[in-house]
Amino acid sequence: ACDTATCVTHRLAGLLSRSGGVVKNNFVPTNVGSKAF
């Protein structure tokens, strides 16, 4: 799990924009993005 401020902020933003169980979030968190690039 990612517990940095950035990841926590992104998770909160995702929860606030949750629609039908699918998170509509354009901010890719560091635990996802940093593994790809």
């Epitope: 799990a1 901010f27 560091t30 635990n31 996802v32 993005g33 593994k35 790809a36 690039f37």
Partner: antibody, heavy 111, light 112 residues
Framework: QSVEESGGGLVQPEGSLTLTCTAS???????AMWWVRQAPGKGLEWIG????????TYYASWVNGRFSISKTSSTTVTLQLNSLTVADTATYYC??????WGPGTLVTVSS | AIVMTQTPSSKSVPVGDTVTINCQAS????????LAWFQQKPGQPPKRLIY???KLASGVPSRFSGGGSGTQFTLTISGVQCDDAATYYC???????????AFAGGTEVVVK
Amino acid sequence: QSVEESGGGLVQPEGSLTLTCTASGFDFSSNAMWWVRQAPGKGLEWIGCIYNGDGSTYYASWVNGRFSISKTSSTTVTLQLNSLTVADTATYYCARDLDLWGPGTLVTVSS
Amino acid sequence: AIVMTQTPSSKSVPVGDTVTINCQASESLYNNNALAWFQQKPGQPPKRLIYDASKLASGVPSRFSGGGSGTQFTLTISGVQCDDAATYYCGGYRSDSVDGVAFAGGTEVVVK
């Protein structure tokens, strides 16, 4: 370890299509699965990704709600394509953390 | 949104020579190094060569190397071989931007 896309084909404008990404040989839950597309003769374009740990999804803003990524089983992820236009004609790739790519599946939008 | 720009768009290089491809990000990338390089041959999916700007992916020949930091990055192929003929793309990531993932337009490397 492998990733493979399926479900591509010919679809009419304003139509819908569901693409499936099937993974094998690795722990699915600890990875993110990315969708990237490539129009004929053009470059790579990020669509979105899903973190399999919690199912969170992330999209490029141009997607604008037309596409949706879901985890449908322990080894499969889908990309639902809606309101398709000719400009969506492309090869659609699924990739694990961008380090393991499938061969792609071609989606052609034409009347 | 980040924008990735790659130069040149095409490069012709003799076998055995060294070629350098440049990649520029419109903003500093995550950790100053969230930059990957991909190789794509016709009819094939992309293959990741470099990640974290300079780390060689597993199984990639050592003639490939990546460098740079922040917004300016390079891919260098030393002692180019015929098998290196392909299109190369850089892709970058920034965590605090909407559309914080982007790919550049690519560089076609032709081996003479």
